[in-house]
């Protein structure tokens, strides 16, 4: 047997050497034919002469006395050698214009060449097969065809690729999908049905490669073909738009010198669409920038987002502007299967500065020392400033308001802050100031409801004091009542000022009412022993918050604070 | 922003029927399905049932199959659970939840409504 | 069905605390978990989907991480609005299954 094999080898060579002295249409390596097949599954491979090369089938050449013969190179090597169509259970068999194998092996690797030829004729092409390896994942260095789904749109299917011709139509094969190593069953949103895989909606989670193995039975034995195919999710062309271009726009204008280097992006969003070309282009003075004599660069990027829609960006530069490049009109332009839209950027000389003399700016100089020191002086001294001025030339507010209180006191109802508000707050705020407050459980009568009389009292008063503590924002108490009431207010109808006083920091908190009001409103903070002292900051910021009212109570110490002697006992 | 309010629960005897609605306000439902999810008193979150916003197929618990009905009334963006032969071990609150159409995941929920199955 | 197992069923913390709760699912669901909060009388909150991806809108003190089968929720610095209880959610195969919650409480 094997010498027979040597014989047929020897005399095969000798076909070939022959055939290169006569003359036979080469269509060499065909490249673009790269045929990767898994080891141990069956593989046919048809010649692609007939495919691709010449224009008639194998049935007509048959019929026409032309002979298909098969011959490969193994991996690494040179040698053209006969394929042996004798193996054990017929391993590598030739149908017709097929080349089959039952099933492949690891070291079937290699390129094939099918010629056709008779006496008078001959053509020939090789294409190059892997055999390659896969684990239990179905990983393996294979190129995988990608399928694209769109998401927001409904049930989709993907088929089994490349089994058709393996077993006949009265065959029926058992298909197993996998979503990457899972076995497809009850699947939230992908249904197996037979050769298809039903995607009843397609989200983002679903990108991934998915394989099916077809099971069937042939001449006493089960083969297995595995396909794997990448599911990539697109966005929907139900969802799909017309370019955008976000740059350049109307806000932004480019203004720039003879001299200096000009800069443009385009920016342009393109919504997926299958098989569409996304193009952006500049025009200047409505040619492109190669159709004129100015020294133009575009570099382009491309960004796409998780279900492929397109981001890209042309920018435009030219080193060395000149003053006639400043006048020219510099057009975007994007087009796609949707539409076509363009956008002109606003291009502009910059104005040169005139030229100062030194007096000129020695008087700059002097007016900018000036005003920093104006700043300095109101940025130490505001408070002082502006409690002068309520003194002296303040309206009073209170008059004729319809109010009954200056201040109604929100408070965590807890021992310490009780403590705050009932002998410091009141103490000071009532006895020095002159202020009349609105503390709920000193003013309210008994037996009343709550959120009634609440409402009410902040109705009457012209500010809301709220007393900031970690207790503060416990869900659910009467103090957020108040706050939500008194922003309420004063978001509405716009009757009453809310005046945060942080007794204690509250870290973060999920009250949305208070994150709101802490970021519009500016919070004043007590700092313990620091803050009692009369000239302190916190008495002052205090006073600035309140109406404006002119009270017989209060004296010209007003000006400088308060008296140290009604703190001291607090 | 989408907000889904549930409706229709209430007391009723066993072997009786109810009528869950959810609807949907500030907006359309979207997403990828619509989900009902209960939740017995003191108990744990069990799925339901959904209804595809595309094809509206539908997808039972067994332990409601054959009793439960899930629709949709796109034109009123409202969701329904058609309840019949109510038993005792139904009792629970009755969520509706949006699946989100990029991701597996619940991303808006109802306030729930209250379902009592007693004699 | 898949079970879904959390663990603990209680945890007692306290504010500042790093808070760690697992999920294990009876078979592999790939990264197609979620994870929610649920307050007492209110809906769930979606914190995490995808296993590990951070739902809009939620502090970063959360998140979460796995695949497979064994999956973590994580809270980095537990807040005092944070005491709740937390489900985890798979979404991979139907019926959807939920674990029957872990209780995070004050200690």
């Known amino acids: 047997m094997t010498l027979l094999w040597c014989v047929v080898s020897l005399y095969f060579y000798g076909i070939l050497q022959s055939d290169a002295s006569e003359r036979c249409d080469d269509w060499g390596l065909d490249t673009m034919r790269q045929i990767q097949v898994f080891e141990d599954e069956p593989a046919r491979i048809k010649c692609p002469l007939f495919e691709h090369f010449l224009k008639f089938n194998y049935s007509t050449a048959h019929s026409a006395g032309l002979t298909l013969i098969w011959y490969w190179t193994r991996q690494d090597r040179d040698l053209e050698e006969p394929i042996n169509f004798r193996l054990p259970e017929n391993r590598i068999s030739k149908e017709k214009d097929v080349l089959w194998f039952r099933p492949t092996l690891l070291n079937d690797t290699g390129n094939y060449t099918c010629m056709l030829r008779n006496t008078t004729y001959c053509s020939k092409v090789a294409f190059p097969l892997e055999v390659v390896q896969k684990d239990s994942c179905f990983n393996s260095p294979m190129k995988l065809p990608v399928h694209k789904l769109y998401i927001e749109y409904g049930i989709q299917r993907i088929t089994c690729p490349n089994v058709d011709g393996y077993f006949p139509s009265s065959v029926k094969p058992t298909i197993t999908w996998y979503m990457g190593c899972y076995k497809i069953q009850n699947f939230n949103n992908v249904i197996p049905e037979g050769m298809n895989l039903s995607f009843l909606i397609a989200l983002i989670s679903n990108n991934g490669n998915y394989t099916c193995v077809v099971t069937y039975p042939e001449n006493g034995r089960t083969f297995h073909l595995t396909r794997t195919l990448t599911v990539k999710v697109v966005g929907s062309p139900k969802n799909a738009v017309p370019p955008v271009i976000h740059s350049p726009n109307d806000h932004v204008v480019y203004e720039k010198e003879p001299g200096e280097e000009l800069l443009i992006p385009c920016t342009v969003y393109f919504s997926f669409l299958m098989d569409s070309r996304n193009e952006v282009w500049w025009t200047i003075d409505g040619k492109k920038p190669d159709d004129i004599t100015i020294d133009v660069t575009i570099n382009e990027s491309i960004s796409h987002s998780r279900t492929e829609d397109e981001t890209r960006t042309q920018i435009l530069s030219i080193k060395k502007v000149t003053s006639e490049d400043l006048k020219r009109s510099y057009v975007c332009h994007a087009r796609s299967a949707k539409g076509e839209v363009a956008k002109a950027a606003k291009v502009k000389q910059k104005v040169p500065a005139p030229r100062y003399t030194v007096e000129l700016a020695c008087g700059f100089g002097a007016t900018v020392l000036l005003v920093v020191i104006l700043i300095v002086v109101y940025h130490v001294y505001w408070l002082e400033m502006v409690l002068f001025y309520r003194a002296h030339f303040g309206t009073d507010e209170t008059i004729l308001d319809g109010k009954e209180y200056d201040i109604y006191v929100s408070y965590a109802r807890n021992a310490e802050e009780e403590e705050f508000v009932l002998l410091t707050l009141r103490g000071v705020l009532e006895n020095e100031f002159g202020y009349k407050l609105c503390i709920f459980d000193r003013d309210s009568l008994p037996g009343g409801i709550v959120t009634d009389e609440t409402l009410s009292f902040i109705q009457k008063s012209r500010r809301l004091l709220v007393v900031l503590s970690p207790n503060y924002v416990l869900q659910g108490t009467q103090a957020l009542l108040e706050l939500k009431a008194g922003l309420e207010n004063m978001a509405s109808r716009g009757n009453i000022n809310v005046i945060l006083v942080q007794y204690k920091a509250v870290k973060e908190t999920k009250v949305k009412e208070l994150k709101r009001a802490k970021t519009v409103l500016t919070v004043i903070k007590w700092k313990g022993e620091k803050s009692k002292y009369p000239q302190g900051r916190f008495w002052k910021q205090l006073q600035v918050a309140m109406p404006v009212k002119k009270s017989p109570r209060r004296s010209s110490s007003d000006e400088q604070g308060l008296s140290y002697s009604s703190l001291k006992n607090v | 922003e989408v907000q889904l309010v549930e409706s229709g629960g209430g007391l009723v005897q066993p072997g009786g029927s109810l009528r869950l609605s959810c609807a949907a306000s500030g907006g359309t439902f979207g997403g990828s399905a619509m989900h009902w999810v209960r939740q017995a008193p003191g108990k744990g979150l069990v799925w339901v049932s959904r209804?595809?916003?595309?094809?509206?197929?539908?997808t039972y618990a067994e332990s409601v199959k054959g009793r439960f009905t899930i629709s949709r009334d796109n034109a009123k963006n409202t969701l329904y659970l058609q309840m019949n032969s109510l038993r005792a071990e139904d009792t629970a609150v009755y969520y509706c939840?949006?699946?989100?159409?990029?991701?597996?995941?619940?991303?808006?929920w109802g306030q729930g409504t209250l379902v009592t199955v007693s004699s | 069905d898949i079970q879904m197992t959390q663990s603990p069923s209680t945890l007692s913390a306290s504010v500042g605390d790093r808070v760690t709760i697992t999920c294990r699912a009876s078979?592999?669901?790939?990264?197609?978990l979620a994870w929610y909060q649920q307050k007492p009388g209110k809906a769930p909150k979606l914190l995490i989907y995808d296993a590990s991806s951070l739902e809009s809108g939620v502090p970063s003190r959360f998140s979460g991480s796995g695949s497979g089968t064994e999956f973590t929720l994580t809270i980095s610095s537990l807040q005092p609005e944070d005491f709740a209880t937390y489900y985890c959610h798979q979404l991979l195969i139907y019926p959807h299954t939920f674990g029957q919650g872990t209780k995070v409480e004050i200690k």
């Open positions: 209804i595809l916003t595309y094809g509206g197929i539908a």
């Open positions: 078979q592999s669901i790939s990264s197609w």
């Open positions: 939840a949006r699946g989100s159409s990029e991701y597996p995941k619940f991303d808006i």
